[in-house]
């Protein structure tokens, strides 16, 4: 009788489809992830199963709490799609598909500087390029640890460019750039490049 009641409940909103989610949607290879399969019904003892494409990854029982499946994303095929099944006795429902985006982390970018010196000004062109890492890559330029450019998105493996004009400075300035893609909390920085304070021979980046 209980099985019949559960199946009837599944035809109503009492037993909707489970929800499959992860706090991390963008990952890099080798990263450990946790997947959460949860259900709105907190009173039923539910058996949760996790699938990737057409393989079964594991089964857990739960009541009131989401089932947590811990995985390591080491191969491209492990991006998904995943789906979760919630089962009560002989009745079951499936979640929507969930897929991770696998992103290669950016490598440290290289900053190049080109300067055109006039009597009063320096026209500076900054180039920044990270040769590895999934596109798009966002580049930001810094002067003395302060951002001087907006994030510049590059969808190809070409350097980001930023131009600025400065009065001939009285002190030396340090430039660097940051490269970041969709991987959260993962940014890399170029080595700093220092511009000397005075003109003449002490402007190694200047076009004569």
């Amino acid at each position: 009788r209980k099985a019949v009641l559960d199946c009837e409940a599944m035809k109503t909103n009492e037993f909707p489809s489970p929800c499959l989610d992860s706090k991390t949607k963008v990952v890099m290879k080798g990263q450990n992830v946790s997947m959460f399969c949860s259900h709105k019904n907190k009173s039923l003892q539910i058996t949760y199963s996790l699938f990737r494409r057409k393989t079964h990854l594991g089964t857990q029982d739960g009541k009131g709490e989401p089932a947590i499946f811990n995985l390591s994303i080491t191969e491209a095929h492990e991006s998904g799609p995943y789906k979760c099944k919630a089962q009560v006795t002989s009745c079951s429902k499936y979640s929507r598909d969930f897929s991770f985006t696998i992103v290669d982390p950016v490598t440290s970018p290289v900053l190049n500087i080109m300067v055109i010196q006039t009597e009063t000004d320096r026209h500076i062109t900054l180039h920044c390029l990270s040769v590895n890492g999934s596109l798009p890559i966002n580049y930001t330029f810094f002067e003395n640890h302060v951002a001087i450019s907006p994030a510049i998105s590059k969808y190809d493996r070409e350097p980001a460019e930023f131009n600025l004009t400065k009065k001939n400075p009285g002190e030396e300035e340090e430039y660097r750039c940051e490269a970041k893609n969709r991987l959260p909390n993962y940014a890399t920085y170029s080595h700093p490049v220092t511009m000397p304070s005075t003109g003449g021979d002490s402007c190694p980046f200047c076009l004569k």
């Epitope: 699938f51 079964h56 594991g58 099944k85 079951s92």
Partner: antibody, heavy 119, light 112 residues
């Protein structure tokens, strides 16, 4: 070259045990699923059980308890341990590999090994 | 237990004929399409023809096709060739009572 080679078949008495091996080459068992299938003389194909890339095992109802699938990643080999053998277990035993993340799309098969259960 | 009923159990046909084999499952396969078809010749291991109910495996001639969903599936050979005389099996994957697979009992295609 991707291939599977079964071994360990032969003549065994009723009630006896036998361990079959399935040696994989050209791919890693940590990525692919291996399934054991048998075929009695002149009969249908019969699913015995499966071990997936995570080491999870699954068995047909009739095989559960008597048959055990395991693997040794260092040898890239899967085993089928068969206990309490009966005359009706006489068959050619195949191991087969599934597609990545598709346990039962069996695209690579071994040549089979014959198990005869007789007194 | 899950039953995979294959029909007919045998059939005779001529080269050039269109041949249809069906598999009826007692329960829906996983994802409604977890079904594959195999060809087996005497003394040989089976060969994968169709997966995902309708997708052609690598290297399989286009005269083979699959269709169906849920519990009812069909393998069609549009124009039978001499090398197609063999036994054909379906294999379904299930998650209703554990993660489970079941073969149909085969259809033997012989020369008329």
């Amino acid at each position: 070259e991707v291939q599977l080679v079964e071994s360990g078949g032969g003549l065994v008495q009723p009630g006896g045990s036998l361990r079959l091996s399935c040696a994989a080459s050209g791919f890693s068992l940590t990525i692919y699923t291996i399934t054991w299938v048998r075929q009695a003389p002149g009969k249908c194909l019969e699913w015995i059980g499966t071990i997936n890339s995570y080491g999870n095992t699954y068995y047909s109802t009739w095989a559960k308890g008597r048959f055990t699938i395991s693997r040794d990643n260092s040898k890239n080999t899967v085993y089928l341990q068969m206990n309490s053998l009966r005359a009706e277990d006489t068959a050619v035993y195949y191991c087969a590999r599934g597609y990545v993340d598709s346990d039962w799309y069996l695209n690579i098969w071994g040549q089979g090994t014959l198990v005869t259960v007789s007194s | 237990a899950i039953q995979m009923t294959q029909s007919p159990s045998s059939l005779s046909a001529r080269v050039g004929d269109r041949v249809t084999i069906t598999c009826q499952s007692s329960e829906s396969v996983y994802d409604n399409n977890y079904l594959s078809w195999y060809q087996q010749k005497p003394g040989k291991a089976p060969k994968l023809l169709i997966y995902d109910a309708s997708r052609l495996a690598s290297g399989v001639p286009s005269r083979f096709s699959g269709s169906g969903s849920g519990t009812q599936f069909t393998l069609t050979i549009s124009s039978l060739q001499p090398e197609d005389f063999a036994t054909y099996y379906c294999l379904g994957g299930y998650d209703s009572s554990g993660w489970y697979a079941a073969f149909g009992c085969g259809t033997k295609v012989t020369v008329l």
